[in-house]
């Protein structure tokens, strides 16, 4: 198939990093600077992505592959191929149209990106709150009352051993 295709279309012989120049009897010409072709047989090259402003270059453009960008410190990538950079916030905050705002009571964010999420509702699982939540951390749910029945394993620490000769009050 490849041999048939190349007989039919001379451009299929042009490798990545070149374009098939129709003005020059379909010879393979190298891509101009700041452009690339990642596949063979292309009739034009593609303009290299330029990582400017809040974007910084993670990988330089070559004649066969596009540049790759990431974000400058204080920003993080969003979208396929880091198409956008979004401002970081502190843990315990979320980004709004007016900038970084603290999470409302009852919500938390343990990352520098994303939105504040509600604390876990321990009672939905029949559990109790072992550690209270903060703006930066979710609550930690403790054992359910059923877990505390005799013979059941418990996450609560064991009671300290009584001294000999002391009877329970």
């Amino acid at each position: 198939f490849e041999r048939t295709r190349s007989l039919q279309d001379p451009c299929s012989n042009c490798p990545a990093g070149t374009f098939c120049d129709n003005n020059r009897n379909q010879i393979c010409s190298p891509c101009p600077p700041n452009s690339f072709s990642s596949a063979g047989g292309q009739r034009t090259c593609d303009i290299c992505r330029q990582c400017k402003g809040v974007f910084r270059t993670r990988k330089e453009c070559s004649s066969t592959s596009n540049a790759e960008c990431d974000c400058t410190p204080g920003f993080h990538c969003l979208g396929a191929g880091c198409s956008m950079c979004e401002q970081d916030c502190k843990q315990g905050q979320e980004l709004t149209k007016k900038g970084c705002k603290d999470c409302c009571f009852g919500t938390f964010n343990d990352q520098k990106r994303g939105i504040c999420r509600p604390w876990t509702n321990c009672s939905l699982d029949g559990k109790s709150v072992l550690v209270n939540g903060t703006k930066e951390r979710d609550v930690v749910c403790g054992p359910s009352p059923a877990d505390l029945s005799p013979g059941a394993s418990s996450v609560t620490p064991p009671a300290p051993a009584r001294e000999p000769g002391h009877s329970p009050q």
């Epitope: 374009f19 010409s29 891509c31 600077p33 034009t44 090259c45 593609d46 303009i47």
Partner: nanobody, 122 residues
Amino acid sequence: EVQLLESGGGLVQPGGSLRLSCAASGFTVSAEDVGWVRQAPGKGLEWVSAILDRGGSTYYAESVKGRFTISRDNAKNTLYLQMSSLRAEDTAVYYCARVVYHAGGGVTYDYRGQGTQVTVSS
């Protein structure tokens, strides 16, 4: 119609210098991305140098960095390539080229001149 006329080539000894000129008509060199490509005997075309982003940046192939300098004279609508410390491997036909940006986002280039032969030999 776009026309590019190269001159300044010749026979030079290794370590010598040459200055190539490209007189352009049909477009303005200061408003375009322009440069030089070369074709060595039995080899494919190679980009040597270019002035890009309307003069905002320059490109040099690794093999010529520090030895070649690209420039232009807007008043004369002429592009230049100053070549120094020439080596045998610089022997090639040198063409002036204009980068062409297509509506669909593709990039190609024109090099319509006859080129100028540079031969580096002792």
